[in-house]
């Protein structure tokens, strides 16, 4: 049994890091493998992650972490029974994938303005809370070419757009994702999409 693709990990910089790797053949990850991880810190304890299958030869493990900070560094040991298959390390702050924003809502009752709001996925005491910027994707269910991205570079998790910038009388969907420049993160996954019917009063022409 050998590791074909070494584990690569990403952290949500809050409580979970996800590691993925590939074996050289079909593997029952949960029964045959264990990923041990330990913070390189005084008094830290070793933890064991039981991996799940991710395709025939692929495995994925969700590592639970407390109080993640930039100085943290973890040792990782991948075991198959008594055999050490791979040894490495992982610094969560250098591989951050933020959590996806939630609770995306479209408010259509503000005079010909669409107000989109969503929730910041981090608590106020997490460093990323004040450092997320967002991308909002809006698209038409009827017209695949009607697809647009709005970059939200301010901290408030909201976006206002004129309803008239979209076509009237048709349905639209929106979703939002986040990233943080400070840790050079990847983009988060998209939030679940929300749907609304866009209708607004056409301006009266003289």
């Amino acid at each position: 049994m050998k590791v074909l693709q070494e584990p690569t990990c990403v952290s949500d910089y809050m409580s979970i890091s996800t590691c993925e790797w590939k074996m050289n053949g079909p593997t029952n990850c949960s029964t045959e493998l264990r990923l041990l991880y330990q913070l390189v810190f005084l008094l830290s304890e070793a933890h064991t992650c039981i991996p799940e299958n991710n395709g025939g030869a692929g495995c994925v493990c969700h590592l639970l972490m407390d109080d993640v900070v930039s100085a943290d560094n973890y040792t990782l040991d991948l075991w198959a029974g008594q055999q050490l298959l791979w040894k490495g390390s992982f610094k969560p702050s250098e591989h951050v994938k933020p959590r996806a924003p939630g609770n995306l809502t479209v408010h259509t009752n503000v005079s010909d303005t669409l107000l989109l709001t969503w929730s910041n996925p981090y608590p106020p005491d997490n460093y990323l809370y004040n450092h997320l910027t967002y991308a909002v994707n809006i698209w038409s269910e009827n017209d695949p070419a009607d697809f647009r991205i709005y970059n939200v570079t301010y901290l408030e998790p909201s976006l206002r757009i004129a309803a008239s910038t979209l076509k009237s009388g048709i349905s639209y969907r929106a979703r939002v994702r986040a990233w943080a420049q400070c840790y050079n993160t990847t983009w988060s996954e998209w939030s679940p999409s929300t749907k609304w019917h866009n209708s607004y009063r056409e301006p009266f022409e003289q």
């Epitope: 810190f41 005084l42 008094l43 304890e45 407390d66 109080d67 900070v69 930039s70």
Partner: antibody, heavy 116, light 111 residues
Framework: QVQLVQSGAEVKKPGASVKVSCKAS????????MHWARQAPGQGLEWMGI????????SYAQKFQGRVTMTRDTSTSTVYMELSSLRSEDTAVYYC?????????WGKGTLVTVSS | QSVLTQPPSVSAAPGQKVTISCSGG????????VSWYQQLPGTAPKLLIY???KRPSGIPDRFSGSKSGTSATLAITGLQTGDEADYFC????????????FGTGTKLTVL
Amino acid sequence: QVQLVQSGAEVKKPGASVKVSCKASGYAFTSYYMHWARQAPGQGLEWMGIINPSGGSASYAQKFQGRVTMTRDTSTSTVYMELSSLRSEDTAVYYCARGKYWMYDWGKGTLVTVSS
Amino acid sequence: QSVLTQPPSVSAAPGQKVTISCSGGSSNIGNSYVSWYQQLPGTAPKLLIYDNNKRPSGIPDRFSGSKSGTSATLAITGLQTGDEADYFCGTWDTSTVWEWPFGTGTKLTVL
């Protein structure tokens, strides 16, 4: 919100021991390390040691090795710092502080006076 | 005996800028991150800066930190009378055993 509530002031005689408590609330108690530091009157801060509330293991500054013991009670989310063989130089305000590499939150402090 | 050295005192007028230095060595500041604490008279210390230059939520951006080599600096701009306090730097040292030294402390007076 995070609160670290420390026990009240103590007056002790030289040679005695003192046990200071620090009750934590507003966060997952076993997820954060706890430090203890002290500050003699008009002096700076001095680090004493750190405890991992999850497993209960502790590590102490070399200066206090053999004289200090840090423990925790997960059922009450409380950490304790006991200092023995007290001398007058141990008169200080003793602080618990939540954190790992740095101290996010501090208790208000417990004044321990050692006097004959 | 603290291994992190700070000036005993600094002073400046309201609205001015002041800097406080913290000098250490290769086994502590040179190899770790620096934090800064503010201690108002009669109160417990409060985290002001961590990770060399990051501010906890609620700390105004008038406070900033930096690190270069084995020294660190706390800068306070737009001084206010409420900033009058003692300031301590802190880090950790893993040279022999893990320890968390604090700086000697600096008394800031707002004139």
